[in-house]
Structures are given as structure tokens and as C-alpha cells.
Amino acid sequence: VLPAKPENISCIFYYEENFTCTWSPEKEASYTWYKVKRTYSYGYKSDICSTDNSTRGNHASCSFLPPTITNPDNYTIQVEAQNADGIMKSDITYWNLDAIMKIEPPEIFSVKSVLGIKRMLQIKWIRPVLAPHSSTLKYTLRFRTINSAYWMEVNFTKEDIDRDETYNLTELQAFTEYVMTLRCAPAESMFWSGWSQEKVGTTEEEAPYGLDLWRVLKPAMVDGRRPVQLMWKKATGAPVLEKALGYNIWYFPENNTNLTETVNTTNQTHELYLGGKTYWVYVVSYNSLGESPVATLRIPALNEKTFQCIEAMQACLTQDQLVVEWQSSAPEVDTWMVEWFPDVDSEPSSFSWESVSQARNWTIQKDELKPLWCYNISVYPVLRDRVGQPYSTQAYVQEGIPSAGPVTQADSIGVKTVTITWKEIPKSKRNGFIKNYTIFYQAEDGKEFSKTVNSNILQYRLESLTRRTSYSLQVMASTNAGGTNGTKINFKTLSISVL
């Protein structure tokens, strides 16, 4: 059988290294060797690259080496496959070396900010040594913030006569570390160099970008004062490296600015004690270069009716995220504040919050929440400066079996009945939503019986027991992950009824 006709011939000129062609099929059933016929020097010269030695038969590539690589040039290439049965020739293909030239990557030697120029980095590099001197090179600069996985790209060209191998990358974030990598190619070529070694640079620091501001309203105290826990953080989009030296807070009752009070703090939380009226609160952060824009919050009057617009809310888990979605009757509301914190028996140690805009869902990576912990999640609608009634739900990112079973006791023991009572498992030991309880009971040397009840039941009356009989009993609490038995208790039914 004749060899297959060589097809899909693809050639690439590795500048000053070799000119290599590959083709298909890559493997033949029988031993096949190949010849690559070439004309070069604009047709003036011809030669052949052959794989016909025993070690390289069946090898679907061949390389021409210097000094027979001329540039610029047009090459004609034809591949011949030969086996014991005969020869098959490819179609003749034509290659302009400028269009298939691949050069070494450039080397970035500095990525620096330029004094006094904001949000810009100047990249300086060394043009590859192995690149045609007179050629215009095209470049792709890839860049990303140091903690991002997503690259952005910018393309540009440089004439050889420039000899100014620099590029000013603008419209970056202030005071942010960027990773840069660069590749290049002759302007006419379809083949890019590899990417250069990555280099890191940091844009100049500026005054703080801004703050996100929120509050927790606490019940009024006996003396009528209202504790309001203010909290703030760098606004979404603020530079990762940004550090504030401190924060200025000022607040006053609505329409009464002459009662303005001010506070300076270096913390990101502060408790205010306000009267029952409506208050306005303002916070700015500052560093050595200036102040951030003002973050504003309206604290409603104690007796103010808040609007309600969230009708329903669902929390669901994807492979690596917790997704909370809600439905609203108010299309004009497009900002929401999401709060989440662990549902524990004591004061929550961590309280988190985040603003959501132009969406009715919120997602968080599962690994940002602790498994086996129940989280309270509340969503507040925000319409301009008004905050509406929250809607709350609970969620686990991963359920487990309870760490302990219910503590159980037997009450009202009768001749044939007993009332079993058990305590709720402490929140810290539930490890999931308790979906039901199962009571296992067994007479001495007898068969075991069980009864399953809903999670809202903490007491159950067992009937049809045998008089004057010892029983052992335990209650199992179950989550979606499985159940855990509580302590085993023993009781004995009475021999006669005691009124």
C-alpha cells in the first residue's frame, strides 16, 4: 500500500535557528520515510531535508538549518512520503518567511511608576537579540493585578528605529501591584514569540479610593439612647495595598448641623449613641496624600416605618459557592445590603456585610465560610438613603452529623406509657439543620422499636409499653448528613397505676 499523501503542511521559521515543516499523517502503518524538497533564495537554490535514516523514519517533520536559511525569502516546499510500495507527493506549498517568522521573547527589565504620574506603569524591555534588525515588531503586553487570575492585554508596535523599548500602561488602579509579561513578533508574522519572564510593578499611592459604610441598629437603652454600631471598609475596587492612617466621622440630627459631633479613630468600627431622631453620619478615610470621598449613611428615627419589599429568599449550594437569591415587589430598588454571621449561642465573633448592586442574588465562595456552621443571612433593600426591612434565612455550606445527641429524660412514667423529653442540641454541636429525631426504645431482652418525629418536637409520649418492664431508650438527632445518638437512659414501667 502506498503511503498516505502528506497533507496539512505547516512551516515555521525560528529566526536564525531553523526552518521546520511538519505534516500529517504523523504515523504510517508501514515504515515510511520522508523528503522535504525546498526551493529558496527566491527559487535560485534547491535542497532536500530527508528523514531517511533508520532512527527517524515515520517522523513527520524536517528542519533546514543555517546557513541555508535566507531572510527575507520565499520558499517552495513539497513533502514526499516513501515506503516499500512507492512514493506519494504532497501539493506544492509556498511560504513567505516574514509571515512565519518566530523570534525569541523580549526581556522585561523594569516595571516602574513614573513620579507624579498617577495610575501608570512604565515598562522597559530589551528587544530580543535574535530578531531581524530592520523589522517593525508587534507586541502584546499582558497584565493583571497580583491577586487576580485574569489577564488583560494591550497590543502595540515599535519601529526598529525607535530604539526606545518602553511602553506606558495607563488607566490602572492606584497603589496596586501588577504582574506584566510581554511577547513579540515581526509585524507581518503569524507566529508570536513565547511570553517573557513575568515582572512585577506597583502604581503610585493616592488618597484613599473610598469607603463602604454600614450599621447595626441595636435596641434603645433605658435612658432612651440608641446604640448604633458603625462599620466601614475599603470600597469595592479600592487598591489592595491601600492603607488608611485613620478615619474621621461626623454626625448630626437631620436639619440640625450645629449639633454636629466628630470622632477620629483608627479602627474600622465605632459605636455611636444616638437620640430617637433621624441622624446623618459621614465617614472619610485619609492617608498622607489626602482624604477619600465621603461615605454617607442615614440612621432612621426610632419610630420610622421602614418599607418592606423582599417577598421570598432562597439559599442554595453549587459545587463551590453558596448562592442566595431573593424576589422583590419593588423594581426601583437595585441596591441591597447583605449581612452574614455565624448563628452561635454567644455573641457572634465575626460579622460580615457586602453591598450588591443591580442584581437580586449574592454569591460567596464556600471556602470563605466554615463548614458545619450555621450562618444567618439577612438582605436589606436600600433605596437611595432609605434602608428597608431585612429578609433573613439560614444556611450551611456543608452539613455533618451532630457532634452530640440530645440529652434525654423520662417523665410521667406509667404502667404502659412514658413521656420522653429531650433538649435541643446546642447550636455549636448541630453541624447541620436538624430535620428529625428518632426515639429508639427496647424492653429488656426484647425487640427494638423506633419512632421518628419532626425537628420541632422535643417531647413524645410512648404508649403500649409492657407493665413492670425495664426499658432502655435513646434519641437520635439527624441532619442531612446522618444521625447521632444521645445518652442512653433506662426506666421501668409501673406495676400499678398511681393516680
Partner: antibody, heavy 131, light 108 residues
């Protein structure tokens, strides 16, 4: 047996035209380059023109540039030399020659390399340009 | 064009004696593209040496070639009667291809 047979040589007046043909046999014609080389009476060899295996013109001697044209017809195993505006100094025996890929001593590396050289010559055809 | 100068233009050698022909190029030529031919009296030329030093099929090992750049040499270790004729060098490296003017070898 490899053979090159030239024809078309003749006596022609200055300014006239002539077409030389060279029919090849005994080898796969389209794998080879072909050249015309001439030799004026009692003089040395002069390369006139050549055509590569792919059908591309190798070039022309300065003395014939613009007047002579080389071509090949692979289906007929024939190479042609069209000669126009002939001059007395074009009088010569015109040889058809085959350019074959010959392997140079191993250059190292993974592959073998072959370069094309004139290795077979025809017997020649005489062109006389005279009034 | 590249001018190829051969020396001597003629050479008379006794049988069994060595002979040497020089070929000098007006500019550098790749050794891959330097060839020697012999044209025996009344015959077409035949290929002797290609790529400066590789012998063509059937050529006696009495013939050897060497050189690089602009200076190339053809040597015959022991001249025999069948070696008479005109020897030509030719370069393929630059267009147009050019021959030397020829060196006539005869037997004393």
C-alpha cells in the same frame, strides 16, 4: 538509462528567434531542476538559465536577460529555451543539463541534506546566428 | 556577478605525477555550492566534485577538492591519460551561476 536530447538548434539571422527543446527520459522529470549551458566555439562554458523542480525560474545570465525565457512542461518531460533578438555572440552549442539532489557528507544532526547540482548533460544542439 | 578565475589556464603533466588547479572567486562562496567539471575532448562536460569536496558517483579517488571562502583547489594525486581535457569550476551560490574560464590538462 538517463537521457537528455536537445533539439531546435539552427542557423538564424541576427534579431531572429529560436526555441530549443530538451526531452528527458529515464528519471522522474518533476523531481529535478533543469539548466541550459552554452559553449561558444573554442571557448569555455557559460551558464544561460535554469528552472527549479517546482517550476520557478532560477535566473538568467546577464548576457541573455530579457531576451531568453526558460520554461518546462512536466507532462511532456520537456524543458524549453525561447530565444528572441538573437545576436552573433549567441552562437554556441547549447547543452541541456539536469540538476540532481546529491547528498553532502553528513552534516550532523537528525537529518540528511541534499543539494542540487548539474550531474547529467545532453549532447548539445548548435545555434548559429549569422547574416 | 561572481567572477571565477582559474590558474593555471593550461597544465602539462607527466603520467603518475600530481596536478593542482586553483579557482579563486571574486567574493566569498559557500563551500556547498562549489563544483568541478571535466570536459573531455569532443564530449559533454561531466561532474567530478560537488560541495567543494564530495566526489560524484564513479569518480576516481585520485580526484579531491578542498577550500573555502574565495579559494578552492582541485587535486589529482596521480595523473593518468584518461584525465586529459578542460577542467571547470563553477559557483552556484550567487546569481547568475558562473564558471571559471577553464584549465586545459594534457599529458607530457
Amino acid at each position: 538509462e538517463v537521457q537528455l536530447v536537445e533539439s531546435g538548434g539552427d542557423l538564424v539571422k541576427p534579431g531572429g528567434s529560436l526555441r530549443l527543446s530538451c526531452v528527458a527520459s529515464g528519471f522522474t522529470f518533476d523531481d529535478y531542476g533543469m539548466s541550459w549551458v552554452r559553449q561558444a566555439p573554442g571557448k569555455g562554458l557559460q551558464w544561460v538559465s535554469g528552472i527549479n523542480w517546482a517550476g520557478g525560474t532560477i535566473g538568467y545570465a546577464d548576457a541573455v536577460k530579457g531576451r531568453f525565457t526558460i520554461s518546462r512542461d512536466n507532462a511532456r518531460n520537456t524543458v524549453y529555451l525561447q530565444m528572441n533578438s538573437l545576436r552573433a555572440e549567441d552562437t554556441a552549442v547549447y547543452y541541456c543539463a539536469r540538476e540532481s539532489p546529491l547528498r553532502l557528507g553528513d552534516l550532523g544532526g537528525d537529518y540528511f541534506y541534499y543539494y542540487y547540482y548539474i550531474d547529467v548533460w545532453g549532447q548539445g544542439t548548435l545555434v548559429t546566428v549569422s547574416s | 556577478e561572481v567572477v571565477m578565475i582559474q590558474t593555471p589556464l593550461s597544465l602539462s603533466v607527466s603520467p603518475g605525477e600530481p596536478a593542482s588547479i586553483s579557482c579563486r572567486a571574486s567574493q566569498s562562496v559557500s563551500s556547498r555550492y562549489l563544483v568541478w567539471y571535466l570536459q573531455k575532448p569532443g564530449q559533454s562536460p561531466q561532474l567530478l566534485i560537488y560541495g567543494t569536496s564530495s566526489r560524484a558517483t564513479g569518480v576516481s579517488d585520485r580526484f579531491s577538492g578542498s577550500g573555502s571562502g574565495t579559494d578552492f583547489t582541485l587535486r589529482i594525486s596521480r595523473v593518468e591519460a584518461e584525465d586529459v581535457g578542460v577542467y571547470y569550476c563553477q559557483q552556484y551560490d550567487n546569481s547568475p551561476r558562473t564558471f571559471g574560464q577553464g584549465t586545459k590538462v594534457e599529458i607530457k
